[in-house]
């Protein structure tokens, strides 16, 4: 069968029906990320509370993050939400402190329960706070006479970063 002439059009171009199916470059502020496209997509614009993390090119869309004081929510940073402090979570009534027994080590997201050391047969080496998880120590068996010395494990997770902890500081 006949090959579709449009299949020869590479990314960054579109198959222009108005010009005898010639491969035309995508117009400014548009892109095509795959070959054989009959139209180019409009570039995303990072405006308002969004800022440009990656510029649009003829072959890839722009990527946004959030301006200072805000962080991304949703796939592809579809929304920006105000930062809270570590030790808090955002509710409908604003940022609220984590309840006792929970923590949040980021400026975004929800408060999570402290690790239950006893479930792993371990003891609490360092108490938890609103901002930090507990640190579990060696199990009682490890502390029995003759047991080899044990280095306390590091916290289960490292403090996370919101987009603007990394950028623009």
């Amino acid at each position: 069968g006949l090959q579709d002439p449009c299949s020869n059009c590479p990314a960054g171009t579109f198959c222009d029906n108005n010009r005898n199916q010639i491969c035309s470059p995508c117009p400014p502020n548009s892109f095509s990320s795959a070959g054989g496209q009959r139209t180019c997509d409009i570039c995303r614009q990072c405006k308002g509370v969004f800022r440009t993390r990656k510029e649009c090119s003829s072959t890839s869309n722009a990527e946004c993050d959030c301006t200072p004081g805000f962080h991304c929510l949703g796939a592809g940073c579809s929304m920006c939400e105000q930062d809270c402090k570590q030790g808090q979570e955002l509710t409908k009534k604003g940022c609220k402190d984590c309840c006792f027994g929970t923590f949040n080590d980021q400026k975004r997201g929800i408060c999570r329960p402290w690790t239950n050391c006893s479930l792993d047969g371990k003891s609490v080496l360092v108490n938890g706070t609103k901002e930090r998880d507990v640190v579990c120590g060696p199990s009682p068996a490890d502390l029995s006479p003759g047991a080899s010395s044990v280095t306390p494990p590091a916290p289960a997770r490292e403090p996370g970063h919101s987009p603007q902890d990394i950028e623009g500081r």
Partner: antibody
């Protein structure tokens, strides 16, 4: 309607600490951030810092070691403190609200003139 | 820090004139630029954010444009009440920085 009102001491001596209060109405500090900006007489604007709705703060590095911003949400007040004052800190000090749409200032207080002099 | 350089520092215009103020950022700030108007003896007032969006209640004769490093504030038909100093501000990264201001006088 949205209003912000600064109240300051007017005259402060060098090396002392400046303390200004911004009282807000028409919006909640639970939902909005508040910036502090100053303007020396006859000069331009300088951003000093911001306190966000959750209470986290960001400061201008040029002043960071001298500035403290805090708030009392129940009183609708934001507090600004600047330590180790010199004559160069003489300025009009403004508080301004940050909207939910960008990191900018949509409503401003009328400003309070602070003179640093012995 | 990102420097915001405004020009001209002052200009004089007649009522009905079209006036343009420019602002250049020392590095790419996308469209994260706001413009403020400060009338003599008053606090600044927000005019435009995101380079081109008018704040609520701002007359349509004020418009903004630009992206990257070059930005423009245009007053299509100057009115007597536009006597003021105009400032640009970038909010792409900390610290937030302002331009030096453009003082508009009315002939």
């Amino acid at each position: 309607q949205v209003q912000l009102q600064e109240s300051g001491p007017g005259l402060v001596k060098p090396s002392e600490t400046l303390s200004i209060t911004c009282t807000v109405s028409g919006f909640s500090l639970i939902s909005y951030g508040v910036h502090w900006v100053r303007q020396p007489p006859g000069k331009g604007l300088e951003w000093l810092g911001v306190i966000w709705s959750g209470g986290s703060t960001d400061y201008n590095p040029s002043l960071k070691s001298r500035v403290t911003i805090s708030k009392d949400t129940s009183k609708n007040q934001v507090s600004f403190k600047l330590s180790s004052l010199t004559a160069a800190d003489t300025a009009i000090y403004y508080c301004a609200r940050n909207p939910l749409t960008a990191t900018v200032m949509d409503y401003w207080g009328q400003g309070t003139l602070v003179t640093v002099s012995s | 820090d990102i420097q915001m350089t405004q020009s001209p520092s002052s200009l004089s215009a007649s009522v009905g004139d079209r006036v343009t103020v420019t602002c250049r950022a020392s590095q790419n700030v996308g469209t994260n630029v706001a413009w403020y108007q400060q009338k003599p003896g008053k606090a600044p007032k927000a005019l435009i954010y995101s380079a081109s969006y008018r704040d609520s209640g701002v007359p349509s004769r004020f418009s903004g444009s630009g992206s990257g490093t070059d930005f423009t504030l245009t007053i299509s038909s100057v009115q007597p009440e536009d006597l003021a100093t105009y400032y640009c501000q970038q909010y792409n990264s900390y610290p937030l920085t302002f331009g030096g201001g453009t003082k508009l006088e009315i002939k």
